[in-house]
């Protein structure tokens, strides 16, 4: 009776209804349910679709742009609980841009355990004011229900019985208003006595058992719940999982072999991102918490003696640390199986953050490369680093490589720090604040003295405060697309071509052509330029067929101007003369591409034969917008509109007076205040600073949510495997 069907994994159903049938036998969706981006579906496609077995979703329910879907009452008639274990941007229920949805109709939804509700931009959606969300979830104040038809007071929601002058549905008070509560014109909202809390009640109003959640078929019986407040085990709801069971996914009890199967399935699969489940604190969880390590015989997490020895195997043998976030991925590692490249350009409280995340590393099997870390003053955040093995070496046989670190003053405090480098050489170039004496001290301590060759430690670019380039590099080829720029420049070779280490390409967005090389750089490591390292091209003896060095800049913004320059990276010659070259700063604009969608369309009818549309320009025009395309289609009339008795008490008239939508906002304000002045002898007050700030914050929050939604739901198409198991997705 309790969860009569199957436990199904989270689902993302898009483009068409084909995969919706996978829900047929599901009682619980362990994960989220997303139904979205169906542009060709029609109301009749949903007529015979129903999933009465679905009782609970453990994460969230998201509906986005599903055309033709007018109500959820038939689709999910028995959905009772959305747990919100994982949320979509803080929301457990998201209904966004559902163009044909007229009502929610989730008349059995009794509990949203965690998270809140976001219902936005559904221009046909009514029956929102008739739902008392406080009976379903705790954090009602975090709900975001805006820009629906309901906002315009044009809905005329009629609860069951109202048409016959009766009140069938319970009424509750919200904001001082005593209102009947219903989901549709034929379904009341079930409101249980307050003493039942969130456990639910029977039709007669008797409370369900305290372990129930939302509803039950008989009172005070944990085997007759529709869903469980805590955990589900063998047909009954329990407060906690008794031995030999373990808590799983915050809602059910599983045995050891279930957890073990999950562990081995992941261990034996090549799928990235799966978890080798372990057991800790009576829970079957994805991984051991910090300070614990897994006992492979019984999957139990056991406390480490001292810091946990944690060998971290790096994908592809190396990892670039370019932010605190990427450093956090190595938190707790004591042995790095691979090589580390440190490339930190800026950040807050860096030394402390880096020490917290990298401070336990004792050994690196490959090489350590510190490259262009403008923000670093010292490497002392590698507090416990004692050994660099050099089993894999940077090109040139280097196991320690320090290149172009503008503010690096100290390696370690050599009076307190021991470091052994088993094999490989040291490389130091372009560290203007790092004294040679510090480098020579490292040679002695690390046991690398005598390994270095003449140009491995540059005498003039370490510990100096200046460097100069004396030749001009010219760009020979520039090609743009909407997100790429391909650059080539004339070859440059110093008198001894081996002195050329490569090129550095600097670029950044530049709306105006007034950029200088040193903009945005400061002693704290801030640098507004993005920098790319480029190897020198293969050298040809024939000057005519010299390869032009170049770089393809990817992932750029459309219709955006970039400032770009390139300079050489050279060693210093014996004669202590500086060679090198640098280009002027050039400005290149990427091409235009398709704009994002126009925002906030509003339609107003000013007569029986006209509709006036108004919208805002897209947030990302991606070019100069020359025109908009407007499409329209005649819709069939809704029979419900004819059946309503518009003279009924309680029906609100549309309160919106028609005003030409293309007037400037200023003139609208002016007209409005005149109107109010004549009617009520007062004018509208100017907005306070806090009101303006609140509006700005709300606008920003809305944009952030939309960006998040688009980033999550629009994913690259997956290849069709021929099994029908993977869904083609819009890119």
């Amino acid at each position: 009776h309790l969860y009569p069907g199957e436990v199904c994994p989270g689902m993302d159903i898009r483009n068409n209804l084909t995969r919706l049938h996978e829900l047929e036998n599901c009682s619980v969706i362990e994960g989220h349910l997303q139904i979205l981006l169906m542009f060709k579906t029609r109301p009749e496609d949903f007529r015979d679709l129903s999933f009465p077995k679905l009782i609970m979703i453990t994460d969230y329910l998201l509906l986005f742009r599903v055309y033709g879907l007018e109500s959820l009452k038939d689709l999910f008639p028995n959905l009772t609980v959305i747990r919100g274990s994982r949320l979509f941007f803080n929301y457990a229920l998201v209904i966004f841009e559902m163009v044909h949805l007229k009502e929610l109709g989730l008349y059995n939804l009794m509990n949203i355990t965690r998270g809140s509700v976001r219902i936005e931009k559904n221009n046909e959606l009514c029956y929102l004011a008739t739902i008392d969300w406080s009976r379903i979830l705790d954090s009602v104040e975090d709900n975001y229900i805006v820009l629906n038809k309901d906002d315009n007071e044009e809905c005329g929601d009629i609860c069951p019985g109202t048409a016959k002058g009766k009140t069938n549905c319970p009424a509750t008070v919200i904001n001082g208003q005593f209102v009947e509560r219903c989901w549709t014109h034929s379904h009341c909202q079930k409101v249980c006595p307050t003493i039942c809390k969130s456990h639910g009640c029977t039709a007669e109003g008797l409370c369900c058992h305290s372990e129930c959640l939302g509803n039950c078929s008989q009172p005070d019986d944990p085997t007759k719940c529709v869903a469980c407040r805590n955990f589900y085990l063998d047909g009954r709801c329990v407060e906690t999982c008794p031995p030999p069971y373990y808590h799983f996914q915050d809602w059910r009890c599983v045995n050891f072999s279930f957890c073990q199967d999950l562990h081995h399935k992941c261990k034996n699969s090549r799928r990235q991102g799966c978890h080798q489940y372990v057991i800790h604190n009576n829970k079957c969880i994805p991984e051991c918490p910090s300070g614990y390590t897994m006992n492979s015989s019984n999957l139990l997490c056991t406390p480490c003696l001292g810091p946990c020895p944690k060998v971290c195997h790096l994908l592809e043998g190396e990892k670039t640390i370019d932010s605190v976030t990427s450093a956090q991925e190595l938190r707790g590692c004591t042995v790095i199986n691979g090589s580390l490249i440190i490339n930190i350009r800026g950040g807050n409280n860096l030394a402390a953050e880096l020490e917290a995340n990298l401070g336990l590393i004792e050994e690196i099997s490959g090489y350590l490369k510190i490259r262009r870390s403008y923000a670093l003053v010292s490497l002392s955040f590698f507090r416990k680093l004692r050994l660099i093995r050099g089993e894999t070496l940077e090109i040139g046989n280097y196991s320690f490589y320090a290149l172009d670190n503008q503010n690096l003053r100290q390696l370690w405090d050599w009076s307190k720090h021991n470091l052994t480098i088993t094999q490989g050489k040291l490389f130091f170039h372009y560290n203007p604040k790092l004294c040679l004496s510090e480098i020579h001290k490292m040679e002695e301590v690390s046991g690398t003295k005598g390994r270095q060759e003449r140009n491995d430690i540059a005498l003039k670019t370490n510990g100096d405060q200046a460097s100069c380039e004396n030749e001009l590099l010219k760009f020979s080829y520039i090609r743009t697309s909407f997100d790429k720029i391909l650059l080539r420049w004339e070859p440059y070779w110093p008198p001894d071509f081996r002195d050329l280490l490569g090129f550095m390409l600097f670029y950044k967005e530049a709306p105006y052509q007034n950029v200088t090389e040193f903009d945005g750089q400061d002693a704290c490591g801030s640098n507004s330029w993005t920098v790319v390292d480029i190897d020198p091209p293969l050298r040809s003896n024939d000057p005519k067929s010299q390869n032009h060095p170049g770089w393809l800049m990817r992932g750029l913004k459309p219709w955006t101007q970039y400032a770009i320059f390139v300079k050489t990276l050279v060693t210093f010659s014996d004669e202590r003369r500086t060679y090198g070259a640098k280009s002027d700063i050039i400005y290149v604009q990427t091409d235009a591409t398709n704009p994002s969608v126009p925002l906030d369309p509003i339609s107003v009818s000013n007569s029986s034969s006209q509709i006036i549309l108004k919208w805002k320009p897209p947030s990302d025009p991606n070019g100069n917008i020359t025109h908009y395309l407007v499409f329209w289609e005649r819709q069939a009339e809704d029979s419900e509109l004819f059946e309503l008795d518009y003279c009924l008490k309680g029906l609100k008239l549309p309160s919106r007076t028609w005003s030409p939508p293309f007037e400037s906002e200023d003139s609208q304000k002016h007209n409005q205040s005149e109107y109010e002045d004549s009617a009520g002898e007062c004018c509208s007050c100017p907005k306070t600073d806090s009101q303006i700030l609140k509006e700005l914050e709300e606008s920003s929050f809305r944009k952030t949510f939309e960006d998040y939604l688009h980033n999550v739901v629009f994913v690259p198409r997956k290849t069709s495997s021929g099994t029908g198991a993977e869904d083609p997705r819009p890119s």
């Epitope: 520039i478 090609r479 697309s481």
Partner: antibody, heavy 118, light 110 residues
Framework: EVQLLESGGGLVQPGGSLRLSCAAS????????MSWVRQAPGKGLEWVAV????????DYAHSVKGRFTISRDNSKNTLYLQMNSLRAEDTAVYYC???????????WGQGTLVTVSS | QSVLTQPPSASGTPGQRVTISCSGS????????VNWYQQLPGTAPKLLIY???KRPSGVPDRFSGSKSGTSASLAISGLRSEDEADYYC???????????FGGGTKLTVL
């Protein structure tokens, strides 16, 4: 109607030179990068050279670099390919093509045959 | 030797669905969009599909393109005798810094 029309092909001896022309009509010639693409008899397509809208940037396939020069005259809506030091392996039908997203070929000419033979 | 690999030939009967593959690498198809061309006997190539799956106006919807990883494919449904031609794929190649073509596939309608 958007059209490209090549001319200037013919028979030439190895080591000789030839200049191909491509007359464009029906579109704003100066707004597009243009390419030459060739097809040896019974073989596939091979990109030869490209030129930017204003003619300031050019690029060539390795096989022709240093021997061929692409140029354009926007006032005459014409694209050129100057071919020097011709070899037998340069024998092909040469097409001029309008570029789209860095790849030639949203519009093609009918082609002109170049035969390099002694 | 072409950078992009296509089968030299393909065939089908009228009304059938035929697929032509085009295999590349991460530096071309893997990171850039693919175009498909049709070359009828004795004529210049004609753009059939651009940006992996978009059709220029005038190209029937029987022709469709797709891309996955470092491979692309052209599908022709409801095959007709006038579809008998050579078909070429093309993409930009980041490492060669230029456009590359497939060797072409000769489609025969039986």
């Amino acid at each position: 109607e958007v059209q490209l029309l090549e001319s200037g092909g013919g028979l030439v001896q190895p080591g000789g030179s030839l200049r191909l022309s491509c007359a464009a009509s029906g579109f704003t010639f100066s707004s597009y990068w243009m390419s030459w693409v060739r097809q040896a008899p019974g073989k596939g397509l091979e990109w030869v050279a490209v030129i930017s809208k204003d003619g300031s940037s050019t690029d060539y396939a390795h096989s022709v670099k240093g021997r061929f020069t692409i140029s354009r005259d926007n006032s005459k809506n014409t694209l050129y390919l100057q071919m020097n030091s011709l070899r037998a392996e340069d024998t092909a039908v040469y097409y001029c093509a309008r570029d789209r997203d860095w790849i030639p070929g949203d519009v093609w000419g009918q082609g002109t045959l170049v035969t390099v033979s002694s | 030797q072409s950078v992009l690999t296509q089968p030299p030939s393909a065939s089908g009967t009228p009304g059938q669905r035929v697929t032509i593959s085009c295999s590349g690498s991460s530096s071309n198809i893997g990171s850039n969009s693919v175009n498909w061309y049709q070359q009828l006997p004795g004529t210049a190539p004609k753009l059939l599909i651009y940006d992996n799956n978009k059709r220029p106006s005038g190209v029937p919807d029987r022709f469709s393109g797709s891309k996955s990883g470092t491979s692309a494919s052209l599908a022709i449904s409801g095959l007709r005798s006038e579809d008998e031609a050579d078909y070429y794929c093309a993409a930009w190649d980041d490492s060669l810094s230029g456009p590359v073509f497939g060797g072409g596939t000769k489609l025969t309608v039986l």
